[in-house]
């Protein structure tokens, strides 16, 4: 048997050698057909001559007396050798224009040639066949076809590819589908339906590799075909829009002096569209940059979203711009299957600044210095200035405003906070400044409806003073009701102002009203012992936030702050 194979090989080698002396149309190595098959699985490979190179099919060629000969070159070898069609169980066979492996082995990798010839005609083509190994999760070096599914689109299907012709229609194979490593059974949104896999709805999480394993019987043997494809979930055509040019736009003006570098970005958003060519280009005075003499460079970058929507940026750059360049029209254009748009960039020449004399510069310097001094003085003494102005020129806010109280105090009902409110705040604000405070627990009548009374008191007050502390932010407290009511009143009718006094630091809070209030309003911080002193900023800040009120109980010491005696026993 071995001897016979050697004889056949030598005879075949002789044919190839004689063929070299005769003319044969050699189409070379068809690298476009990089055929990859899994080890230990059947493979059927059609001779590419009839598919891509010749104008007739195998039947025509056969009836014209042409013979199809197969041979191969092993991987990393140069020697062409015949294919052994006498292997046990007919492992490699030829049927018409198809070369069959049942199944493949790893060392079947190589370049295969099919040659069609008779005594007067010869044509041949080679193609690479790679037998690859896969792991238990179907991972392999195989190049995978990509199938795109639309997001938010309804039922879509993928079909197990390249299984036609492996078994007759009378054979009913079993098909198992996998997502990555997982067998698809009762999946959330994916249903196996024989050769098809149906996506009831495609989610971004469905991105990945899907494998169908087709099992079929043949001549008492069982064969498996493994086919993997990549699913990519992309933007739906229902949501597709024409290109959107984000820049240039009407808000940005490119103002340059001659000699400077001009950089204009054109940023365009393209909705994902299957097989759409997205294009971005610049025109200068209506011409493409290549058609004009200016030294222009254009750099492009492309980024994609999770659903393959595309953002393209083309930066037009002129290294040293001239005044003529600054008078030109720069227009960015964009086109997709959905339409074409264009936007002009606003380019203008910067007016050079006039040359200032030394005197003018000195004058400007002196002015700046004076302004800086005034700003510093204002920053240091602004509270005193405001209080001085109010004491002498302020108009009394309280006349005929229909309010009964100056301040409604909202605080956490807690021993420490109560002491601060009833002794410190009340002592100073009522006794020293002559304000009328409304403290719910002191001024409310027993037996009343808390909610109604609270709202009534707040409506009768000019200010809502909120004493912030960690206890304040506990959900469902009376204090929170007061805060919500005050903020509501302030936002809707504007007839109450809210003052935030931070008695104790409050960490991150989930109370949205308080969050919002803290971002909008200034928080006056109580700093313990430091804040008790009359000249302290705390009382001055508080005074500024209070209503302007001409009170006979207030003395000229108001501008100085308050007497220490009123605080020392607080």
């Amino acid at each position: 048997m071995t001897l016979l194979w050697c004889v056949v090989s030598l005879y075949f080698y002789g044919i190839l050698q004689s063929d070299a002396s005769e003319r044969c149309d050699d189409w070379g190595l068809d690298t476009m057909r990089q055929i990859q098959v899994f080890e230990d699985e059947p493979a059927r490979i059609k001779c590419p001559l009839f598919e891509h190179f010749l104008k007739f099919n195998y039947s025509t060629a056969h009836s014209a007396g042409l013979t199809l000969i197969w041979y191969w070159t092993r991987q990393d070898r140069d020697l062409e050798e015949p294919i052994n069609f006498r292997l046990p169980e007919n492992r490699i066979s030829k049927e018409k224009d198809v070369l069959w492996f049942r199944p493949t082995l790893l060392n079947d990798t190589g370049n295969y040639t099919c040659m069609l010839r008779n005594t007067t005609y010869c044509s041949k083509v080679a193609f690479p066949l790679e037998v690859v190994q896969k792991d238990s999760c179907f991972n392999s070096p195989m190049k995978l076809p990509v199938h795109k599914l639309y997001i938010e689109y309804g039922i879509q299907r993928i079909t197990c590819p390249n299984v036609d012709g492996y078994f007759p229609s009378s054979v009913k194979p079993t098909i198992t589908w996998y997502m990555g490593c997982y067998k698809i059974q009762n999946f959330n949104n994916v249903i196996p339906e024989g050769m098809n896999l149906s996506f009831l709805i495609a989610l971004i999480s469905n991105n990945g590799n899907y494998t169908c394993v087709v099992t079929y019987p043949e001549n008492g043997r069982t064969f498996h075909l493994t086919r993997t494809l990549t699913v990519k979930v992309v933007g739906s055509p229902k949501n597709a829009v024409p290109p959107v040019i984000h820049s240039p736009n009407d808000h940005v003006v490119y103002e340059k002096e001659p000699g400077e570098e001009l950089l204009i970005p054109c940023t365009v958003y393209f909705s994902f569209l299957m097989d759409s060519r997205n294009e971005v280009w610049w025109t200068i005075d209506g011409k493409k940059p290549d058609d004009i003499t200016i030294d222009v460079t254009i750099n492009e970058s492309i980024s994609h979203s999770r659903t393959e929507d595309e953002t393209r940026t083309q930066i037009l750059s002129i290294k040293k711009v001239t005044s003529e360049d600054l008078k030109r029209s720069y227009v960015c254009h964009a086109r997709s299957a959905k339409g074409e748009v264009a936007k002009a960039a606003k380019v203008k020449q910067k007016v050079p600044a006039p040359r200032y004399t030394v005197e003018l510069a000195c004058g400007f310097g002196a002015t700046v210095l004076l302004v800086v001094i005034l700003i510093v003085v204002y920053h240091v003494y602004w509270l005193e200035m405001v209080l001085f102005y109010r004491a002498h020129f302020g108009t009394d806010e309280t006349i005929l405003d229909g309010k009964e109280y100056d301040i409604y105090v909202s605080y956490a009902r807690n021993a420490e906070e109560e002491e601060f409110v009833l002794l410190t705040l009340r002592g100073v604000l009522e006794n020293e400044f002559g304000y009328k405070l409304c403290i719910f627990d002191r001024d409310s009548l027993p037996g009343g409806i808390v909610t109604d009374e609270t709202l009534s008191f707040i409506q009768k007050s000019r200010r809502l003073l909120v004493v912030l502390s960690p206890n304040y932010v506990l959900q469902g407290t009376q204090a929170l009701l007061e805060l919500k009511a005050g903020l509501e009143n302030m936002a809707s009718r504007g007839n109450i102002n809210v003052i935030l006094v931070q008695y104790k630091a409050v960490k991150e809070t989930k109370v949205k009203e308080l969050k919002r209030a803290k971002t909008v309003l200034t928080v006056i911080k109580w700093k313990g012992e430091k804040s008790k002193y009359p000249q302290g900023r705390f009382w001055k800040q508080l005074q500024v936030a209070m209503p302007v009120k001409k009170s006979p109980r207030r003395s000229s010491s108001d501008e100085q702050g308050l007497s220490y005696s009123s605080l020392k026993n607080v």
């Epitope: 039922i155 997502m179 059974q185 959330n188 971004i204 999480s205």
Partner: antibody
Framework: EVQLVESGGGLVQPGGSLRLSCAAS????????MHWVRQAPGKGLVWVSR????????TYAESVKGRFTISRDNAKNTLYLQMNSLRAEDTAVYYC????????????WGQGTLVTVSS | DIQMTQSPSTLSASVGDRVTITCRAS??????LAWYQQKPGKAPKLLIY???SLESGVPSRFSGSGSGTEFTLTISSLQPEDFATYYC?????????FGQGTKVEIK
């Protein structure tokens, strides 16, 4: 921002029927699917049923199959759960939830409606 | 059906603590897992999806990890508003199933 509001809960006798509604305010349902999830008093969450946004395919938990029917009225922006042959073990707070159209997650939930099955 | 087992069932912790809740699936679910927070009388609120992605608007102290059958929810520094019950939820295979819940309470 879409908000979901359930209604239709209440007290019903064993063997009775009830129809729950879930209305979307502030926009359409959107998403990939609408789901019903229930929670018996003091217990955990249990998925009940879903209906797909596209194609209207419905799926049910084994415990309610044949007794409950999920449906939706896109014009009214409302999801329904028709509950027949109610049993004591169906007593729960029923939530409707939206399945996101991008990722597997229930991103918006209603506040829930209580169904009590008792004689 | 896939069983989702959460541990511990109850967890006592203090404000500022690092808290970890584990969820185990009876079979592999890839990363198709979500975590929810539920407070008494309220609807569940989505925290984490796709096993590790943070839902928008959820504080960054919450994080998720894991794939296959083992998943973890971590709260890096427990805040007063985090005391609640937490549920894991597998969305890969029907019927969807939730863990039995982990109650995080004040120590």
């Amino acid at each position: 921002e879409v908000q979901l509001v359930e209604s239709g809960g209440g007290l019903v006798q064993p063997g009775g029927s009830l129809r729950l509604s879930c209305a979307a305010s502030g926009g359409t349902f959107g998403g990939s699917a609408m789901h019903w999830v229930r929670q018996a008093p003091g217990k955990g969450l249990v998925w009940v049923s879903r209906i797909l946004t596209y194609g209207g395919i419905a799926t049910y938990a084994e415990s309610v199959k044949g007794r409950f029917t999920i449906s939706r009225d896109n014009a009214k922006n409302t999801l329904y759960l028709q509950m027949n042959s109610l049993r004591a073990e169906d007593t729960a707070v029923y939530y409707c939830a939206r399945g996101s159209s991008e990722y597997p997650k229930f991103d918006i939930w209603g506040q829930g409606t209580l169904v009590t099955v008792s004689s | 059906d896939i069983q989702m087992t959460q541990s511990p069932s109850t967890l006592s912790a203090s404000v500022g603590d690092r808290v970890t809740i584990t969820c185990r699936a009876s079979q592999s679910i890839s990363s198709w897992l979500a975590w929810y927070q539920q407070k008494p009388g309220k609807a569940p609120k989505l925290l984490i999806y796709d096993a590790s992605s943070l839902e928008s608007g959820v504080p960054s102290r919450f994080s998720g990890s894991g794939s296959g059958t083992e998943f973890t929810l971590t709260i890096s520094s427990l805040q007063p508003e985090d005391f609640a019950t937490y549920y894991c939820h597998q969305l890969l295979i029907y019927p969807h199933t939730f863990g039995q819940g982990t109650k995080v309470e004040i120590k």
